[in-house]
């Protein structure tokens, strides 16, 4: 039975040209995290594997930095980066947990962070 929950940074906004940390946290389970996939729609950004380290998709290698932790730092933001991002936690023995973050990249200098929220 899957008892865990994914806590994410929720809806966030950032300025064009800036950077943002995409962060998820798995709680309420003792399951072992074996891999985390970071995806934007159907496009892979990166994979963090517990044994192997990080695989950064070549399309993003100049703009994506691993971490902190299992999170991902997205740099040199453009308006085209606006959209949904997903952290997919592969765990043993529970299975897969998915968290969602919505990022809005703003032209203006006013970029406020949204509240944290949970996805069961």
């Amino acid at each position: 039975m899957m008892t865990g929950t994914i806590e994410t940074t929720g809806n966030i906004s950032a300025e064009k040209g800036g950077s943002i940390i995409l962060q998820c946290h798995l709680s309420s389970t003792t399951a072992q995290v074996t891999q985390v996939n970071w995806e934007q729609q159907d496009q892979l950004l990166a994979i963090c594997n517990a044994d192997l380290g990080w695989h950064i998709s070549p399309s993003f290698k100049d703009r994506v930095a691993p971490g902190p932790g299992l999170g991902l730092t997205l740099q040199s933001l453009t308006v085209n980066d606006t959209g949904e991002y997903f952290c997919i936690y592969h765990t043993y023995p529970d299975g897969t947990y998915t968290g969602r973050i919505f990022l809005e990249v703003l032209e203006s200098s006013v970029a406020e962070h949204g509240a944290r929220f949970q996805i069961p």
């Epitope: 891999q35 996939n37 594997n49 044994d51 192997l52 380290g53 990080w54 695989h55 070549p58 765990t91």
Partner: antibody
Framework: QVQLQESGPGLVKPSQTLSLTCTVS??????????WNWIRQHPGKGLEWIGY???????YYNPSLRSRVTISVDTSKNQFSLKLNSVTAADTAVYYC???????????????????WGQGTTVTVSS | EIVLTQSPDFQSVTPKEKVAITCRAS??????LHWYQQKPDQSPKPLIK???QSFSGVPSRFSGSGSGTDFTLTINSLEAEDAATYYC?????????FGGGTKVEIK
């Protein structure tokens, strides 16, 4: 010498689930530097990658099939499996399992070639 | 996803002739390009990895070259047993992809 062998029903009815297993012999599926793939080939056509699984359970699926695919691993049996649900005639194909190797270092890893392939199993979707 | 375009689709060649098959990637894949040979009713057999590294047991008449987006598989002095379909494959970026294949027929 590592060998891979696909097994499963050769005939599946439309809307049902296709289930195949790949048995690894001559080596351990739990090796850190390998990933385990499913590939299919429609009659007279090219190769289509379905997805992979790592021994510890991490997966990545082809986005074109993701909504219908599950790949799982059983390290105790040295096997990994494919489930493809809601099949149609368009899923009729030869299904292959294959071992891919991984290069790792400096905190990063990369996918290499697929060096060992099963002989393939034909799956027909028909009522 | 990275699209691999092979050309030609089909080639009819006389024995001892030289064959060149090209594979073009829709974006740079560095050297993460591999070649497979598939004969009728058989599974693909690895030929060359990382552009130019031959697998063990592969005859020396098979060679590979290229980098970035343009790659070539060359068969020097074709033999009858080389009749097959040849596929390129990239492992640079997920999803992994294959070229559409080049069928080589012996005249």
């Amino acid at each position: 010498q590592v060998q891979l062998q696909e097994s499963g029903p050769g005939l599946v009815k439309p809307s049902q689930t296709l289930s195949l297993t790949c048995t690894v012999s001559g080596g351990s599926i739990s090796s850190v530097y390998f990933y385990w793939n499913w590939i299919r080939q429609h009659p007279g056509k090219g190769l289509e990658w379905i997805g992979y699984i790592y021994y510890s359970g991490g997966t990545y699926y082809n986005p074109s099939l993701r909504s219908r695919v599950t790949i799982s691993v059983d390290t105790s049996k040295n096997q990994f499996s494919l489930k493809l649900n809601s099949v149609t005639a368009a899923d009729t194909a030869v299904y292959y399992c294959a071992r891919g190797s991984i290069a790792a270092g400096g905190g990063y890893f990369y996918y290499n070639d697929m060096d060992v392939w099963g002989q393939g199993t034909t799956v027909t979707v028909s009522s | 996803e990275i699209v691999l375009t092979q050309s030609p689709d089909f080639q009819s060649v006389t024995p001892k002739e030289k064959v060149a098959i090209t594979c073009r990637a829709s974006q740079s894949i560095g050297s993460s390009l591999h070649w497979y040979q598939q004969k009728p009713d058989q599974s693909p057999k690895p030929l060359i990895k990382y552009v130019s590294q031959s697998f063990s047991g592969v005859p020396s008449r098979f060679s590979g070259s290229g980098s970035g987006t343009d790659f070539t598989l060359t068969i020097n002095s074709l033999e009858a047993e080389d009749a097959a379909t040849y596929y390129c494959h990239q492992s640079s970026s997920l999803p992994l992809t294959f070229g559409g294949g080049t069928k080589v027929e012996i005249k």
